[in-house]
Interface confidence: low
């Protein structure tokens, strides 16, 4: 299709060589068409003007992305040629940084009525450069933590070397939606809730005598709780004896709850006590069965192919540990009567 009439936007991604940061492009179709396709809709469905060309397509992912090769070859479908670039609805996600992401990206609706095919597309010229000012690397991270229940702020990494006074107007997006009230290089959060977690994008315009372009950075914000002050607790087994049938296979499950720790290094293991001897048992890998902001429940099973008389004399001990301390729960097997 003819891309000469596409609206053009220039973007700059200055990435930190130290982190696996991500980047996004929004399909900024010219108004009013944009409102029909993407979440960042400024019109309610009742306000959609009748002359909108793409009626009947309510699929939010109904845009097509292409890259324009620099050698003049035909446009390439992003989904086929670039595994590190993912399309999610109207957003293009770049999973890895690198200058090889530089280039022209074109988006347009998939369903086009021919009179509008030229006007309804946007060409984004993306320039990707590594961060050269090493001191700026240290100012704001592309992953930021906010502590639930406290105050905090989200800083725009590409502007964190500048003071608030000299900072230009910033446009912020959260999970692809415009945050219209935020205009400074920092979003101040009076009280942090779990809904503050997400992908934030900050844009500002930079100009020289020739042209202007949008400088964009992406921040992954994680809401966290404070490190636990408690050692893990064992939820299962609860009883210290277990009735079993001799000669039958047996699985004993150990489930433990670990509180949040910034550096999370949980230990959950089984060992056997037999008179004065004690040894750790080789058992299947532990698995996380439930994970929340505050804690994680981890399970690890011990499997006996068949219960023997010898097993009745042993104690099976589940041992769990975090950085605060450890907890154990022992189980004695008892032969089922009758």
């Amino acid at each position: 299709f003819n891309i000469s009439g596409c609206s053009t936007k220039k973007l700059l991604w200055t990435y930190s060589t130290r982190s696996e940061e991500e980047f996004v492009l929004f399909c900024d179709l010219p108004e009013p068409q944009k409102s029909h396709f993407c979440h960042r809709n400024r019109l309610s469905p009742k306000q959609v003007p009748e002359h909108l060309p793409f009626m009947g397509s309510n699929d939010l992912s109904d845009v097509q992305w292409y890259q324009q090769p620099s050698n003049g070859d035909p446009l390439e479908d992003i989904r086929k040629s670039y595994p590190h670039i993912i399309q999610d609805k109207c957003t293009l996600h770049f999973l890895t940084p690198g200058v090889n992401n530089s280039g022209s990206y074109i988006c347009r609706p998939k369903m086009i009525k021919s009179p509008y095919d030229v006007a309804c597309c946007v060409k984004m010229i993306l320039e990707v450069k590594p961060q050269t000012n090493a001191s700026c690397e240290y100012s704001a991270s592309h992953k930021q933590d906010l502590l639930l229940g406290s105050t905090g702020s989200i800083s725009c990494p590409s502007l964190s070397c500048q003071s608030d006074a000299q900072s230009p107007a910033v446009t912020w997006y959260k999970n692809g939606k415009l945050l219209s009230v935020e205009r400074s290089n920092r979003i101040v959060v009076d009280e942090v809730y779990d809904y503050h977690q997400g992908t934030y994008v900050c844009d500002y315009t930079q100009s020289d005598t020739v042209s202007s372009w949008t400088v964009r950075a992406v921040v992954q914000v994680r809401t966290i709780v404070g490190d636990t002050k408690l050692k893990p607790d064992i939820l299962d087994p609860v009883e210290d004896t277990l009735e079993v049938e001799l000669g039958k296979p047996l699985t004993i499950s150990c489930k433990a709850r670990f509180g949040f720790e910034r550096v999370f290094n949980p230990v959950i293991k089984w060992y056997i006590k037999d008179s004065d001897l004690e040894w750790e048992v080789s058992v299947p890998e532990a698995k996380s069965i439930k994970s929340t902001l505050k804690d994680e429940i981890i399970e690890r099973n011990i499997i006996l192919e068949k219960v023997t008389q010898r097993d009745l004399r042993r104690k099976f001990v589940c041992f769990v540990q975090n950085s605060i301390g450890n907890t154990t729960q022992s189980v004695q097997l008892k032969e089922k009567r009758g």
């Epitope: 704001a140 991270s141 502590l147 406290s150 905090g152 989200i154 550096v263």
Partner: antibody, heavy 124, light 107 residues
Framework: QVQLQESGPGLVKPSETLSLTCTVS????????WSWIRQPPGKGLEWIGY???????NYNPSLKSRVTISVDTSKNQFSLKLSSVTAADTAVYYC??????????????????WGQGTTVTVSS | AIQLTQSPSSLSASVGDRVTITCRAS??????LAWYQQKPGKAPKFLIY???SLESGVPSRFSGSGSGTDFTLTISSLQPEDFATYYC?????????FGQGTRLEIK
């Protein structure tokens, strides 16, 4: 550019409390963890503990009973108090930013910005 | 606490030499290891994180490798400014611990 500056008395008497402050300039104290590390003369580095901007702390168990780290976000400062000091606490004390570098599914933590260090001598 | 043991404790080398410093952890720490360089009277400077990822601005002659318990820092061709003490540090579990240091001197 974020810079850290330690301040406090260079001489402390045995059994007293060592108090140091680290001032963060060129960036906000918010959203980061901040650590204290010390280095006795001619020896290696020992991590004392960290504080999150919200006040959450984590201390080295070997010093836990004597250490308190606090934060004042309005002044962009965090502080270290070490009680009942002895000659073994003589060291260069550093403050540092303790940052998570983003890997795909986790963070790899490092101390990426350090103060220049302040020497504290414990002597009567 | 996880103990980190560096070897050698000190070594002498010449400009242009290839040098390797090892760091062994008392238990597995995945890739949660960083390397720092410290010059006399100065604060440590962070060089490598995640065992092998080079901090930006650090010359490419520095490289790190390893996972689990055994790690190495290699300087492919020593420069005059590389003579310093090097520390490994683990961030796998608390308390954070450092190796005892390896002092690199001019031969």
């Amino acid at each position: 550019q974020v810079q850290l500056q330690e301040s406090g008395p260079g001489l402390v008497k045995p059994s007293e409390t060592l108090s140091l402050t680290c001032t963060v300039s060129g960036g906000s104290i918010n959203n980061y963890y901040w650590s204290w590390i010390r280095q006795p003369p001619g020896k290696g580095l020992e991590w004392i503990g960290y504080i999150f901007y919200s006040g959450t702390t984590n201390y080295n168990p070997s010093l836990k009973s004597r250490v308190t780290i606090s934060v004042d976000t309005s002044k962009n400062q965090f502080s270290l108090k070490l009680s009942s000091v002895t000659a073994a606490d003589t060291a260069v004390y550093y403050c540092a930013r303790d940052v998570g570098i983003a890997a795909r599914n986790s963070y790899y933590y490092v101390m990426d910005v350090w103060g220049q260090g302040t020497t504290v001598t414990v002597s009567s | 606490a996880i103990q980190l043991t560096q070897s050698p404790s000190s070594l002498s080398a010449s400009v242009g030499d290839r040098v390797t410093i090892t760091c062994r952890a008392s238990q597995g720490i995945s890739s949660a290891l960083a390397w720092y360089q410290q010059k006399p009277g100065k604060a440590p400077k962070f060089l490598i994180y995640e065992a092998s990822s080079l901090e930006s601005g650090v010359p490419s002659r520095f490289s790190g490798s390893g996972s689990g318990t055994d790690f190495t820092l290699t300087i492919s061709s020593l420069q005059p400014e590389d003579f310093a003490t090097y520390y490994c540090q683990q961030f796998n579990s608390y308390p954070i611990t450092f190796g005892q240091g390896t002092r690199l001197e001019i031969k």
